[in-house]
């Protein structure tokens, strides 16, 4: 509970052993004690203790002193705790009562009487101090004190406040009397759960999780978390804030690790040479004459400059060198010369020149030839002058590159082409490759060179059906037929049913007349296929071997667009505005002969050849369909009709328009 | 180039003492916080001790404190970490570093190993 | 003290191949994170620090994310030197602590 109302009885008086009732106890009243203790009541009434009720055992006979017992039975004071904000106010009832029976549960027996009662109203604040009373009446007196405490961990005027001292991670503190909390040395905050960090420790750079500690953030350090940390990688610098890298005097570099003043320091510089505090390690040697390396540390031989001159041979000597001059030469370095022009001093055709009143000469040399004596032949192929692999040869006064095959030019820096010298026949296309020229062949051509005609008759194979006569095109490979009364069709393969009554003669004129002009498309068809037409196995070597305007009605892989989700290529006509066909399944079947595109043509009846769209492909694409349009295929120089082949995954129909 | 070479490590009993020494060479040893590291043989990494450049202030993990001091000398750009009242425990390769506790340990030594066993 | 937990604890892989090591805390450590490499019998080499910073003379294959408690160092291409030890580290609170490690192998 948060709080317990407490009474102790003192003295009990009942010198004649009376009940209440008027009769008297025999051999005497033995006395124990009910108290009941309620809200406040102006009357007390009879009704529930709200506040608590509590019964004593037998304290005595008749006349008694109660003493004080901390535990057990017949503890004194009475306790009687509550569970709520004590009011302030109360009613106490103390009823005193005679028992026959057990001595310790009184309260249980039968046959208990009532000796005598006191009815106590009041009000009562909270607190240590007992407030003791008395109550007579004609038989019995009541000595008694109470008070009202709170219980362990509640504190205030009513109890109310719950505080509960600790020393752990959730607080330090302990409760003042009114329950407020009261931290222990070293900590603050409401709760008490905030160190009171080392004096002058940075608020900012430092923090603490115990009293008298500082604990530096990330990049600051000391006592007092008021010095930074140097970048990771410094070297020889300190900061200002945090992980900078100001470098120390002396030193220089992102991270202060290069020696401003190197030389100083370490005197790389060996031999004399002089020493610079720059460059990538931080310093560079300058080497005096006749040394090398880093340091200056490699000695180079004193006859290394060839400082001979005229053809003197050099010898090293310790700290120098010496000259052994040829005849007519002397001096340290060979430089003066004893001969004159009457000793033709000159070689190889050099014309000799006086100098200072005939004491000395100087050759001019003819091309080719150099030195003082034009004893030395020039070589003009020292610059690697041939490009291309060429090998350079000095032919006298000049020098001459010798090509490799396939390459030409006075430094073989022009590339012969392989189709220079038109090896392809029968105006077969020629190409350059690595490996040499490559023919690609007309129609009706095959072979390495376009060298091999190919011979084939299109009626061999008998395509035209029911008695239809074949008629090879100008083309080896078209054949166009002609039909029997009763028959259509590109190879008259479909019967024509008739009425009984039919205009036969007006008929047939007008199936005269179309069969006649199916013909004459067919031939100009063929005349168009004719270019067009490669058998499979020629179709790659002679796909590139096309005419002038068939050149220009190429329509290559980057011209086809794909446009849309199903696969269709869609290709844009530009100037032109025929209409043309979507060519669909990326893939064109352009063998066909035009025999094989009559109207209803069958699937399956003919060879394919599905060229990829990869591939320049010859398209005649020229029909009235709206779908797309058609660029770069209509030649100025073509006068022709164009067809478009329309390849749909339903059926195949070939749509011809001609063009006068 | 950044060298830290640690000695002093050996075999020493439980109850014992030992005093590990690190030599620092190529930065400004004085400029930087210093650390101890160790790692006990087949195990992880364990940071033991901290000691700040400017003012000497020294950090340990709970289960040195009392037992092991941290301290330099800058002008012999030294670190130091003596080693009293040993423990079975503090068996490991005990490794120098340049770094704080609340920073990257840029540089490492060798390591020196210390075992401590009767 | 914040736990620092990798995973997985080891790992093998191919030269060639990319690879990723992460490394979770216990609670937030604000990007004060780094990697290190170890190899048998040497010292710890420090790779990445402050989560993703490139420590000075580290390759480029090596780079590291991650932010709040997790974090990952990845290798973009192994090669036959990177078959090591690998330890992640937190300095955002005191005292700092490390992961237990990942070992890469050669599978």
């Known amino acids: 509970g948060s709080g317990i109302f407490q009474l102790r009885l003192q003295e009990f008086v009942n010198q004649r052993g009376m009940l209440a009732n008027g009769q008297s106890c025999e051999p005497g009243c033995r006395t124990f004690f009910r108290i009941c203790l309620k809200h406040f009541q102006a009357t007390f009434s009879e009704g529930p203790c709200t506040f608590g009720n509590v019964s004593t055992p037998v304290l005595g006979t008749n006349s008694f002193v109660v003493r004080d017992k901390n535990s057990g039975s017949g503890r004194n004071p009475l306790q009687l705790p509550f569970n709520f904000t004590w009011p302030g106010t109360f009613s106490l009832n103390i009823q005193a009562w005679h028992t026959p029976g057990d001595d310790l549960r009184p309260e249980t027996s039968p046959g208990n009487s009532l000796i005598s009662q006191i009815i106590i109203q009041g009000s009562l604040a909270v607190g240590k101090i007992w407030r003791t009373d008395e109550q007579n009446d004609t038989l019995t007196r009541l000595s008694y004190s109470y008070r009202v405490i709170c219980s362990d961990n509640y504190y205030g005027e009513s109890c109310s406040r719950l505080c509960k001292k600790r020393d752990d991670h959730f607080g330090h503190y302990e409760c003042q009397p009114d329950g407020s909390l009261s931290c222990l040395p070293g900590w603050t905050g409401k709760y008490c759960d905030q160190p009171i960090c080392l004096s002058g420790c940075h608020e900012q750079n430092g923090y603490c999780s115990k009293p008298d500690e500082c604990i530096c953030r990330p990049g600051w350090q000391g006592r007092l978390c008021n010095e930074c940390i140097p970048h990771n990688g410094c070297r020889h610098g300190t900061c200002s804030i945090p992980w900078q890298c100001a470098c120390d005097e002396g030193w220089g570099g992102l991270f202060c690790d290069q020696d401003l003043n190197y030389c100083t320091h370490h005197s790389p510089c060996k031999n004399g040479s002089t020493c610079s505090n720059s460059g990538p390690k931080g310093y560079t040697c300058t080497c005096l004459p006749g040394y090398t390396g880093e340091h200056c540390e490699l000695g180079l031989s004193k006859c290394a400059s060839n400082p001979c001159r005229n053809g003197g041979s050099c010898k090293d000597q310790e700290n120098s060198y010496h000259c052994l001059c040829p005849p007519g030469y002397y001096g340290q370095h060979c430089e003066h010369s004893t001969l004159t022009c009457a000793d033709s001093p000159c070689f190889n055709g050099g014309s000799c020149r006086e100098r200072n009143q005939g004491s000395s000469y100087a050759c001019e040399c003819p091309p080719n030839f150099t030195g003082s004596n034009c004893e030395k032949k020039v070589d003009r192929c020292t610059s690697n002058p041939c490009a291309n692999g060429g090998q350079c040869q000095n032919r006298g006064p000049s020098r001459t590159c010798r090509c490799r095959p396939g390459f030409t030019g006075t430094h073989c820096e022009l590339h012969i082409s392989d189709c220079a010298r038109s090896p392809c026949a029968h105006g077969g296309t020629c190409h350059d490759l690595e490996n040499g020229p490559v023919c690609t062949c007309p129609a009706g051509f095959s072979g390495r060179r376009c060298e091999v005609r190919i011979t084939h008759d299109a009626c061999a194979s008998g395509p035209c059906f029911n008695g239809a006569t074949c008629y090879t095109g100008l083309s080896p490979n078209n054949f166009v037929c002609n039909c029997p009364y009763g028959f259509v069709g590109s190879r008259c393969e479909f019967p024509v049913g008739l009425p009984p009554s039919f205009p036969w003669v007006a008929v047939s004129l007008g199936v005269g007349l179309v069969v006649l002009l199916v013909l004459l498309v067919m031939v100009v068809v063929a005349v168009r296929q004719l270019r067009l037409r490669r058998p499979d196995d020629e179709s790659r070597e002679a796909m590139n071997n096309l005419s002038d305007f068939q050149k220009d009605n190429l329509i290559p892989a980057a011209q086809l667009k794909n446009t849309n989700q199903k696969k269709e290529l869609e290709v844009d006509c530009g100037l032109d505005k025929s209409n043309c066909g979507k060519l669909q399944n990326h893939t064109l079947d352009y063998n066909l002969a035009p025999g094989l595109l009559g109207r209803g043509g069958m699937p399956g009846k003919y060879p394919h050849s599905d060229k990829s769209l990869g591939e320049k492909v010859p398209l005649r694409l020229h029909s009235e369909k709206p779908e797309c349009r058609i660029s770069a295929i209509c030649s100025p120089r073509d006068s022709m009709y164009q067809s478009v082949c329309l390849i749909s995954e339903e059926r195949n129909e070939c749509v011809i328009a001609t063009e006068v | 180039e950044v060298q830290l070479v640690e000695s002093g490590g050996g075999l020493v009993q439980p109850g014992g003492s030992l005093r590990l020494s690190c030599a620092a060479s190529g930065f400004t040893f004085s400029n930087f916080p210093m650390a101890w590291v160790r790692q006990a043989p087949g195990k992880g990494l364990e940071w033991v001790a901290t000691i700040s450049s400017s003012d000497g202030t020294t950090y340990y993990r709970d289960s040195v404190k009392g037992r092991f001091t941290i301290s330099r000398d800058n002008a012999k750009s030294s670190l130091y970490l003596q080693m009293n009242s040993l423990r079975a425990e503090d068996t490991a390769v005990y490794y120098c570093s340049r770094g704080y506790y609340n920073s990257p340990f840029a540089y490492w030594g060798q390591g020196t190993l210390v075992t401590v066993s009767s | 003290d914040i736990q620092m937990t990798q995973s997985p604890s080891s790992l093998s892989a191919s030269v060639g191949d990319r690879v990723t090591i992460t490394c979770r805390a216990s609670?937030?450590?604000?990007?004060?994170l780094a990697w290190y490499q170890q190899k048998p019998g040497k010292s710890p080499k420090l790779l990445i620090f402050d989560t993703n910073n490139l420590a000075d003379g580290v390759p480029s294959r090596f780079s590291g994310s991650g932010s709040g408690t997790d974090s990952t160092l990845t290798i973009s291409s192994l090669q036959p030197e990177d078959f090591a030890t690998y330890f992640c580290?937190?300095?955002?609170?005191?005292?700092?602590?490390f992961g237990q490690g990942t070992k890469l192998e050669i599978k």
């Open positions: 609670e937030d450590i604000y990007s004060n």
């Open positions: 580290q937190q300095y955002n609170n005191y005292p700092p602590t």
